[in-house]
Structure formats: C-alpha cells, structure tokens
C-alpha cells in the first residue's frame, strides 16, 4: 500500500513534468495526413492550433536545434514525443496514464467515431515506434467512468 502510494506520487510528478504536447501534435498531424491521402479536405498547417505562432510569449522548446537533421514537422514532434514517453518506460502504469492523458486532451478535437478509433490505434503504437515497451493493458476509452488504470 505504502509503495503504491509512493509510486502514484512519483507517477503524478512525472506526468506534471512531462510535456505531452508533441505527442498530440504528431498524432493529430498523422491522422490528418492519412485522411488527406483518402481524399478528405486538406489539412492546412496554418490552421494548426498548436502552431508556435499562437503562443508568442513562450520559446517553443520543440523548435529545431542544430542537432535536428531529420526533417521538420511531424517527425520532429514524434522525436520529442519519444523523449517524453521515454521517461515513463520503467513504470508501465504511468506510461498508460500518459497515453490516457493524451487521449483525453485530444478527445474534443476528434471528429467522429472513425477518427477517434484511428487516433486510439496510432496512440497504442506510439511506444513501439520509439523503441519503448508498450503497456499491456491500457484502457483508452474516454467516455467510460471507471477506467482500468493499467
């Protein structure tokens, strides 16, 4: 019980320190791109609500550095996302909480059941794409009241 409380506290502080925004950016851009390739309305980057120009007072720590040579846009967001998720690798329950937080943060922006399912599918694949161990059981349903927390 004591260990679990400490574990929960540690996870909470890790979640508070984490910036999961790059994960959200990467996933939204990916599903929008996938929709484009199926002939939906084009997704204009200038309409991206995450565009750094929307937040002029804050230096975006996710802007390119001289060491970033692997293309801009979504792959850069994905690399930043991987670095954030990497902090949770040894705590599978906390990794799940991070994925749930991403799902919750974006649920209002997802249009329709199909987009929601696609977002969820991509979200589940995120850890593996970063070479990280994915949580075995992780309920990403936003609607359900009592979620399985791991």
């Amino acid at each position: 019980q004591q260990w679990e409380l400490q574990g929960d506290r540690r996870c909470q502080s890790q979640l508070e320190r984490a910036n999961l925004r790059p994960c959200e950016q990467h996933l939204m851009q990916k599903i929008q791109r996938d929709e484009d390739s199926y002939g939906r309305d084009p997704y204009s980057p200038s309409q991206d609500p995450y565009s750094p120009s929307q937040d002029p007072d804050r230096r975006d720590p996710y802007s390119p550095s001289p060491y970033d040579r692997r293309g801009a846009g979504s792959s850069q967001h994905q690399e930043r996302c991987c670095n954030e998720l990497n902090e949770f690798e040894n705590n599978q329950r906390c990794m799940c909480e991070a994925l749930q937080q991403i799902m919750e943060n974006q649920s209002d922006r997802l249009q329709g059941r199909q987009q929601e399912q696609q977002f969820k599918r991509e979200l589940r694949n995120l850890p593996q794409q970063c070479g990280l161990r994915a949580p075995q059981r992780c309920d990403l349903e936003v609607e359900s009241g009592g979620r399985d927390r791991y």
């Epitope: 320190r17 001289p66 060491y67 692997r70 792959s75 991987c82 990497n86 902090e87 794409q129």
Partner: antibody
Framework: LVESGGGSVPPGGSLRLSCVAS????????MNWVRQAPGKGLEWISS????????YYAESVRGRFTTSRDNSQNTVFLDLTDLTVEDTALYFC????????????WGQGTAVTVSA | DIVMTQSPSTLSASVGDRVTITCRAS??????LAWYQQKPGKAPRLLIY???TLESGVPSRFSGSGSGTEFTLTISSLQPDDFATYYC??????????FGPGTKVEIK
C-alpha cells in the same frame, strides 16, 4: 559533445567522466556512454533518458559504474568505481534520437588507463 | 543478450570495387539496425540507421538492406576515404544496445 575526466588509476580506483553538450536542447535527448578498449571494438555501457528517470547499464559495468546528468549544466556524468584493467579504454559519450536508436553525435573520447 | 556477428572480419579491396559487409544478429532486431564508420583515433560516424536510411551528409554510394537477423552494408564504388573499420549496431528493448565486432576494409 566534449568528454573529460579520463586519466590513469590503479586497479580498484575511481574516476568521474564528464560530457558537455553545446548547441542542443540537452534535456530532450537520451545520452549514452560507449567505450573502446585499445585495438578492440565498440562496447555500449550505459544510457540515460532526457530527464534522467531511466538509466540502463551493460552487464559488464552494472553495480560499478553510475550514469547521471545535470541538465542545467548540459552535462552527463559517468562515475567509474572498482576499476579493473579490463576497463582500460577510450570512453565516448553519444546522443541517441529515440526514433532511430542510433548514435548520431559523438564526442572525441576521453582515455581511461587502469594499471598497477 | 543479442549477439552481433560481422563477416568478413577483414576485407581487402581496391578503389572502385563494390564492397559488401554482412551483419547477423542472434535474434530478430526488428528495424533497429545502424552502421558506423570509424577511422583510427577518431570517434565513429553514423552512416545508416533503421536498416537502410542514409544519415544526412553520407554519400549515396553507401546503402543498407536486410531484415530480421541478417543485414548488409554495401559500398557501391569504394573510394580512398572509405578505408576504415565498419560496425553494425542493434537496439533491443530488453538488452538495449550492442555492436558487432567490426569489419576492417583495407587496401588490396
């Protein structure tokens, strides 16, 4: 990336190696230590995540070497203890983007010599 | 742990030759496979990551291929600057990183 702290020590001795990064958002990157014994191949010895929550070691150094980082100083450290002659090597630090899991930026290395 | 082997250990070749180096893993490494070039007294240089993706600034005469447990690095036309030692490296969630023993490419 610039390493420092190498030198000669007797068996059983200790050293602290440093690796300073410049021109990079340091806390965004997983960092690693890789060593190369004279005339031998490359051996990965340790990795540390961007904020230091996860640290990994090769079996050959686990329990003797400790990796840490100070993001305010853009520095990663490798503390070497209980050194043996087998630890004599050139020690490199290297950056790893997690999407590639490859070492894309390396330091020039710092030499550690363990001899009686 | 995943053990990496490379063949040949030494390769004698001439400028203009097509050179192939093979790397084998003791178990599948998915796509987490990279190749490096190292010259004496220097740090290694990343050439290829994720099996076949050329690192920025690396000449197109270098290419990588393979899957599962067997991978190859090919230099289509060996140049004077290419005489060096080449290492493969894998990443695995459980055993983390490991390198092959290296292949020295020397002048015939």
């Amino acid at each position: 990336l610039v390493e420092s702290g190498g030198g000669s020590v007797p068996p059983g001795g200790s050293l602290r190696l440093s690796c300073v990064a410049s021109g990079v958002y340091f806390s965004d990157w997983a960092m690693n230590w890789v060593r190369q014994a004279p005339g031998k191949g490359l051996e990965w010895i340790s990795s540390i995540s961007g904020r230091g929550a996860n640290i990994y070691y090769a079996e050959s150094v686990r329990g003797r070497f400790t990796t840490s980082r100070d993001n305010s100083q853009n520095t990663v450290f490798l503390d070497l203890t209980d050194l043996t002659v087998e630890d004599t090597a050139l020690y490199f630090c290297a950056k790893t983007p997690l999407l590639t899991r490859a070492f894309d930026v390396w330091g020039q290395g710092t030499a550690v010599t363990v001899s009686a | 742990d995943i053990v990496m082997t490379q063949s040949p250990s030494t390769l004698s070749a001439s400028v203009g030759d097509r050179v192939t180096i093979t790397c084998r893993a003791s178990q599948s490494v998915n796509t987490w496979l990279a190749w490096y070039q190292q010259k004496p007294g220097k740090a290694p240089r990343l050439l290829i990551y994720k099996v076949s993706t050329l690192e920025s600034g690396v000449p197109s005469r270098f290419s990588g291929s393979g899957s599962g447990t067997e991978f190859t690095l090919t230099i289509s036309s060996l140049q004077p600057d290419d005489f060096a030692t080449y290492y493969c490296q894998q990443y695995n969630i459980d055993s983390r990183y490991s390198f092959g023993p290296g292949t020295k490419v020397e002048i015939k």
